[in-house]
């Protein structure tokens, strides 16, 4: 008799997920030498910890604490890039500007990137048919709350100006309810961080409006300012040619504006 | 066959300055993390310092962080460990060793020995 | 600075088994690779187990290590006199960004 396993909205465990994380820290570790001694099996082991045998729908912060041990990685504190829906482009950035880190260029970031997973109440089992959905079935699932502990401690880590790239497409360019808005601009630490510095990221090759002065801008300004951390922005208006003057700076083009 | 062959050790006064040597062969030593260990008369091992390969990162103990220097020399195959206000307990044999990517040391030099007294 | 527990000493009888513990922290064997080191009185020391329990070529197989949440342990089956020595575990620790060695244990063969 099949054993009844609950139905989620979202989808499942993506496929070989274990495998998966265990090749990806062995990778990280190669690529990163100064992690060279970290043992990826235990990392994998309180990784599958804090979700294994619990209901996907009452996982907290706690369940993760075993594996956040891991994430006293040192990145510089003062070269932090943080993100809101424009991924894509801020880990373009940071392969050129290599001594700039999204928290996806951490270990623990660099594992769960793309991926989903959860387990069941009471069964060892990793569920590969659905998983919760944020929305639809509940915002305290493996992989809401995996992001939301490794966002507020990285978050939390940065120091002197912290960068933010966001997306001047969307019609919020700053949305309350992403993990930027509703976490990480929350936890960074005035004492330690001094300036927060937006980066408006332009779609259209012909927008030349300036997107520093949108309503939603402003409202993270004042988010910021009431936190004591000052605030700047900037218009990059040709993201191609943003990262082409990354790559060469010395480029006589990229004097002027981008 | 990989040879490390440390000098510079011996006798100085607390406060005073020493400068350790090793010289590197049988290996690609600009490519390996390489490191300082020291022994104290009838105690245990102590890690004292590591330098990266590539653009150097240096790692310190609790114990001599500011105090010591660790550095390398590729063109030269040699490590060196420069050691400022020298103490007492600072007393051991000074080993150099080679460091392997999964971070264990797998070649050792014979040590040298450094006495700090007055 | 605290290092790795291990038990002082250990001995047994030529032909026997023993084992030495190493207990740490997450810091240090919770989530890094353990080593051991052989160590004779005025040689240089000996990697014998990486990777909490791969052999360099070279090491007999009497000698096997194993780890499980924050410790380790080393185990020399078949007890020879020349196991006579110190043995050392060693970890990185992310708190302290160095390694930390264990206090070393004393092997004696009986």
């Known amino acids: 008799v099949p054993r009844w396993r609950q139905q989620w909205s979202g989808p499942g465990t993506t496929k070989r997920f274990p495998e998966t994380v265990l090749a990806r820290c062995v990778k990280y570790t190669e690529i990163h030498p100064e992690m060279r001694h970290v043992d990826c099996q235990s990392v994998w082991d309180a990784f599958k910890g804090a979700f294994i045998s619990k209901h996907p729908c009452n996982i907290t912060e706690e369940d993760y604490q075993p594996l956040m041990k891991l994430g006293t990685q040192t990145v510089p504190c003062n070269k932090i890039l943080l993100w809101s829906r424009i991924k894509d482009l801020a880990h373009q950035f940071t392969q050129v500007q290599r001594d700039m880190f999204t928290l996806e260029d951490t270990l623990l970031g660099y594992l769960a990137d793309d991926l989903t997973w959860c387990g069941e109440f009471n069964t060892s089992k990793i569920n590969y048919q659905s998983c919760p959905d944020w929305r639809k079935d509940c915002s305290n699932n493996p992989v809401s709350v995996f992001w939301k502990t490794v966002s507020r401690r990285f978050a939390e880590a940065a120091c002197d100006v912290v960068h933010v790239m966001l997306n001047g497409s969307r019609s919020k360019i700053f949305d309350k309810n992403s993990t930027f808005g509703s976490v990480e601009v929350h936890n960074l630490q005035p004492e330690k961080v001094q300036t927060l510095e937006a980066w408006v990221i332009h779609g259209g090759r012909e927008d030349s409006r300036d997107l520093c002065q949108d309503p939603t801008i402003k409202e993270l300004e004042s988010i910021i300012s009431k936190r004591n951390i000052q605030f700047s922005c900037k218009n990059i208006y040709r993201p191609d040619k943003f990262l082409q003057c990354v790559k060469n700076p010395e480029d006589s083009s990229c004097t002027s504006e981008i | 066959q990989v040879q490390l062959v440390e000098s510079g050790g011996g006798l100085v006064k607390p406060g005073g300055s020493l400068r350790l040597s090793c010289a590197a062969s049988?290996?690609?030593?600009?490519?390996?993390?390489m490191s300082w260990i020291r022994q104290a008369p009838g105690k245990g091992l102590e890690w004292v310092a590591s330098?990266?390969?590539?653009?150097?990162?240096?790692y310190y103990a609790d114990s001599v962080r500011g105090r010591f220097t660790i550095s390398r020399d590729n063109a030269k195959n040699s490590l060196y460990l420069q050691m400022n206000s020298l103490r007492a307990e600072d007393t051991a044999v000074y080993y150099c060793?080679?460091?392997?990517?999964?971070?264990?040391?797998?070649?050792w030099g014979q040590g040298t020995l450094v006495t700090v007294s007055s | 600075q605290a290092g790795l527990t291990q038990p002082p000493s250990a001995s047994g009888t030529s032909g026997q088994r023993v084992t030495i513990s190493c207990s740490g922290s997450?810091?240090?064997?919770?989530?890094?690779?353990v080593y051991w080191y052989q160590h004779l009185p005025g040689t240089a020391p000996k990697l014998l187990i990486y990777?909490?329990?791969q052999r360099p070529s070279g090491v007999p197989d009497r000698f096997s290590g194993s780890k499980s949440g924050n410790s380790a342990s080393l185990a020399i089956s078949g007890l020879r006199s020349e196991d006579e020595a110190d043995y050392y575990c060693?970890?990185?620790?992310?708190?302290?960004?160095?390694?930390?060695f264990g206090s070393g244990t004393k092997v004696t063969v009986l």
């Open positions: 060693a970890a990185w620790d992310d708190s302290l960004s160095g390694y930390v």
């Open positions: 060793a080679r460091e392997a990517w999964g971070g264990e040391f797998t070649d």
């Open positions: 049988g290996f690609t030593f600009s490519d390996d993390y």
């Open positions: 990777k909490n329990n």
């Open positions: 997450s810091s240090n064997i919770g989530f890094h690779f």
């Open positions: 330098v990266s390969n590539g653009r150097p990162t240096t």
